[in-house]
């Protein structure tokens, strides 16, 4: 019997499909300061990949990175150059639980302050078999990390 | 460099049991899943298994549920595989192989040749 | 299980020509979260262990020459070779890793003639 590792029951929408969605919604309430979003966004370079190591229990060898995964910043007109937190924001909340690191709880933190938008949250569950459960943390850590660290080069 | 290490050769009695190991180096071993696969002489591949090194987390072929065993020594850094009641069919070489879970199979031993033979 | 088929089993040819070799998956390989196909081509020599090419379906692994390119989405995939050496005399492997058991092509052998 195959197990779906790749199933999308827990993965309503595609990460590159989320920005768009969300982002065409009502405007932010408060718009944070350029330096404000730049102080965050170099936090979350550093928490992230504090974060990845912590998983991989601090395995510093070269990762394998495919530069089309989806972007994490978004390109809208009212917040430029800002992480797209609302794509973001659902699925570190989906693994948060799993890691039980206060990184992670701060990094939500975080992406919650980059949040300007009143847009329904998108519902990600995690997935139940643990082979998936792992593939799937460690998917969305290394794309967000990755993510971030191609933006600062 | 990452290197995993097999036994070149192992040969035992039908009935018997074998257990082969695979040493890592070069990496972190928990940060990897362990992959076990069978070549047959003159055939093609058979994925056996995998083992989570951090946890000991196991996942079986169904058909080598009752023939293997998989198992994990941290301390060593050697991933084990157990194989019971052999015969002929069971000779073969079996690679270990690292898995990063995201992407793939990336590092293969060189194969341990097992011959059952009386 | 998904099962991995693979075409043709063997094929010779020149060096200097091309090569191209299918392998389909009888289910979808495309992990929705990466939008990445886990689909893996191993090449393997007489008498070696197995060794990476390509992962992602097209992603090709480090220090793999150029002339390999993997290419295909879903459930059909295909490597090709632009310009087959001598040194490329082997049997070549797709195995997904959607889906346990991960499964393996039967393989393709190239012969050089």
């Known amino acids: 019997m195959v197990s779906h590792i790749g199933s999308t029951r827990f993965a309503l929408f595609l990460l590159c499909c989320l920005g768009t969605l969300m982002f065409s919604h009502t405007g932010p309430i408060y718009q944070l300061q350029p330096k404000e979003i730049q102080a965050i966004i170099v936090e979350l370079q550093n928490l992230s990949k504090k974060l990845l190591d912590d998983y991989l229990n601090k395995e510093k060898g070269v990762q394998k990175f495919d530069s089309d995964l989806p972007s994490c910043f978004t390109s809208d007109s009212q917040a430029p150059g800002n992480i797209n937190s609302s794509a973001i924001l659902p699925y570190f909340k989906a693994i948060s639980p799993s890691l039980n690191n206060d990184k992670s709880l701060y990094i939500i933190e975080q992406l919650d302050k980059l949040n300007f938008q009143n847009a329904p949250e998108t519902e990600v569950s995690m997935p139940t078999d643990n082979f998936e459960r792992k593939r799937f943390i460690l998917t969305i850590l290394r794309w967000f990390s990755n993510c971030l660290e191609h933006r600062a080069q | 460099q990452v290197q995993l290490q097999q036994p070149g050769a192992e040969l035992v009695r039908p009935g018997a049991s074998v257990k082969l190991s695979c040493k890592a180096y070069?990496?972190?071993?928990?940060?990897?899943?362990m992959n076990w696969v069978k070549q047959r002489p003159g055939q093609g591949l058979e994925w056996i298994g995998m083992?989570?090194?951090?946890?000991?987390?196991?996942h079986y072929n169904q058909i080598f549920r009752d023939k293997a065993t998989l198992t994990i020594d941290k301390s060593s850094s050697t991933a084990y595989m157990q194989l019971s009641s052999l015969t002929s069919e069971d000779s073969a070489v079996y690679f270990c192989?690292?898995?990063?879970?995201?992407?793939?199979?990336?590092?293969w031993g060189q194969g341990t040749t097992l011959t059952v033979s009386s | 299980d998904i099962v991995m088929s693979q075409s043709p089993s063997s094929l010779a040819v020149s060096v200097g020509e091309k090569v191209t070799m299918s392998c389909k998956s009888s289910?979808?390989?495309?992990?929705?979260?990466?939008?990445?196909?886990?689909l893996a081509w191993y090449q393997q020599k007489p008498g070696q262990s197995p060794k990476l090419l390509i992962y992602?379906?097209?992603t090709r692994e480090s220090g793999v020459p150029d002339r390999f390119t993997g290419s295909g989405s879903g459930t059909d995939f295909t490597l090709t070779i632009s310009s087959v050496k001598s040194e490329d005399l082997a049997v070549y492997y797709c195995?997904?890793?959607?889906?346990?058991?991960?499964?393996f092509g039967s393989g393709t052998k190239l012969e050089i003639k």
């Open positions: 070069g990496y972190t071993f928990t940060s990897y899943w």
């Open positions: 192989a690292r898995q990063d879970i995201v992407t793939t199979v990336d590092y």
């Open positions: 083992i989570d090194p951090s946890d000991s987390e196991t």
């Open positions: 195995q997904q890793h959607y889906g346990y058991p991960f499964t």
């Open positions: 289910q979808s390989l495309l992990y929705s979260i990466n939008q990445k196909n886990f």
């Open positions: 992602w379906a097209s």
